[in-house]
């Protein structure tokens, strides 16, 4: 099952995806698509990187992490209910059957409407428990529900990112675990890739 992430209408949504470059600067092409990962490539591509930069994106989709270190987490700006659904992060490792693919489920909730306060605003009521992930802007928050187990493959940097952020504590609180898996590997076209 997909890992589920939540955001409110009007917020920025954050969908994490990481890999470890074989060497500094040795980037791997990555694509993000709307919809579950197909056999090849990404369907409905919203953003793509190559060996040097972000070379394709559509409005509201961008990378706010250090993609040159393998943080290819997707930010979706100012989400609407229509942004709900499955997103595919595909790490296009050169060679046959080497691609890593991750399906992430984004759930968008209607924005909370709070009555105009007569006195001081009650921030606890207006803003439920949120977390801001390290290295991302203040508007980029993810409302914590009960997070399911995270089913990702051999990507050690995710654990490092989690350990470095407040998310680690929140994941521990929710009982989530990080499991390795090999069932996401697939056959894919060969990709031209150079070391640099």
């Amino acid at each position: 099952s997909e890992v589920e992430y939540r955001a409110e209408v009007g917020q920025n949504a954050y969908l994490p995806c990481f890999y470890t470059p074989a060497a500094p600067g040795n980037l791997v092409p990555v694509c993000w698509g709307k919809g579950a990962c197909p056999v090849f490539e990404c369907g409905n591509v919203v953003l793509r990187t190559d060996e040097r930069d972000v070379n394709y994106w559509t409005s509201r989709y961008w990378l706010n992490g250090d993609f040159r270190k393998g943080d290819v987490s997707l930010t979706i700006e100012n989400v609407t209910l229509a942004d709900s659904g499955i997103y595919c992060c595909r790490i296009q490792i050169p060679g046959i059957m080497n691609d890593e693919k991750f399906n992430l489920k984004l759930v968008i909730k209607p924005a909370k409407v709070t009555p105009a306060p007569t006195r001081q605003r009650d921030f606890t009521a207006a803003f439920p428990r949120m977390l801001t992930t390290r290295g991302h802007g203040p508007a980029e928050t993810q409302t914590l529900g009960s997070l399911p187990d995270i089913n990702l493959t051999q990507i050690s940097t995710l654990a490092n990112e989690l350990r470095d952020s407040r998310l680690a504590n929140d994941l521990r609180d929710s009982g989530a675990t990080i499991r390795g898996s090999s069932d996401y590997k697939d056959d894919d076209d060969k990709h031209h890739h150079h070391h640099h």
Partner: antibody, heavy 121, light 107 residues
């Protein structure tokens, strides 16, 4: 230490071509993109394109793609930038520069001293 | 192409003043902004990369902040040797583009 040493100043007539060289030392030449950036007198910086020496793959700024060719000679760790069909507004200082993550993810950023190319009839 | 709009184009400040330069990207560029210093007749020198990271050997009075589209470069206490033109550059998507520059002078 890392050094990028460029060829000397050139004066060219409109319509001619110029080839600027950039000799690298002090690092593994094939590991980093070599960029070319120009600066017209009193103006800002403009990226022209880059090349990765290990396979010759290059990417050019659309503005220059029909007139520029970037090459490398890995045996001498030298990069070249040739600009054709020169016009007076190509008068500028041309820099080679290399940047990117190096070992331990330390950012690597070095520039040549610049080559003044003057286009005048 | 991503446009980088830098402001102000020039400023004059006194030694010891705090100096702030802003750079606005036409589209989000994540953290991939660099700041360069260029003195007359010299090559650009990297000060900040990845929006906030100080390049090797650069004094700590220089700092950068921001992500997405809005970035700020700060000199906490202006020194006479800081007289130069400063450029921002995006390294998110090629063609890499530079801001128009900010010339910093001493009052």
């Amino acid at each position: 230490q890392v050094q990028l040493v460029q060829s000397g100043a050139e004066v060219k007539k409109p319509g001619a071509s110029v080839k600027v060289s950039c000799k690298a030392s002090g690092y593994t030449f094939t590991d980093y993109y070599m960029n070319w950036v120009r600066q017209a007198p009193g103006q800002g910086l403009e990226w022209m394109g880059d090349i990765i020496p290990n396979n010759g793959g290059s990417k050019y700024n659309q503005k220059f793609k029909d007139r520029v060719t970037m090459t490398t000679d890995t045996s001498t760790s030298t990069a070249y930038m040739e600009l054709r069909s020169l016009r007076s507004d190509d008068t500028a200082v041309y820099y080679c520069a290399t940047w990117g993550y190096g070992s331990s993810y330390r950012w690597f950023d070095y520039w040549g001293q610049g080559t003044l190319v003057t286009v005048s009839s | 192409d991503i446009q980088m709009t830098q402001s102000p184009s020039s400023l004059s400040a006194s030694v010891g003043d705090r100096v702030t330069i802003t750079c606005l990207a036409s589209q989000p560029i994540g953290i991939w902004l660099a700041w360069y210093q260029q003195k007359p007749g010299k090559s650009p020198k990297l000060l900040i990369y990845a929006a906030t990271s100080l390049a090797d050997g650069v004094p700590s009075r220089f700092s950068g902040s921001g992500s997405g589209t809005d970035f700020t470069f700060t000199i906490s206490s202006l020194q006479p040797e800081d007289i130069a033109t400063y450029y921002c550059q995006q390294l998110y998507s090629s063609p890499w583009t530079f801001g128009g520059g900010t010339k910093v002078e001493i009052k």
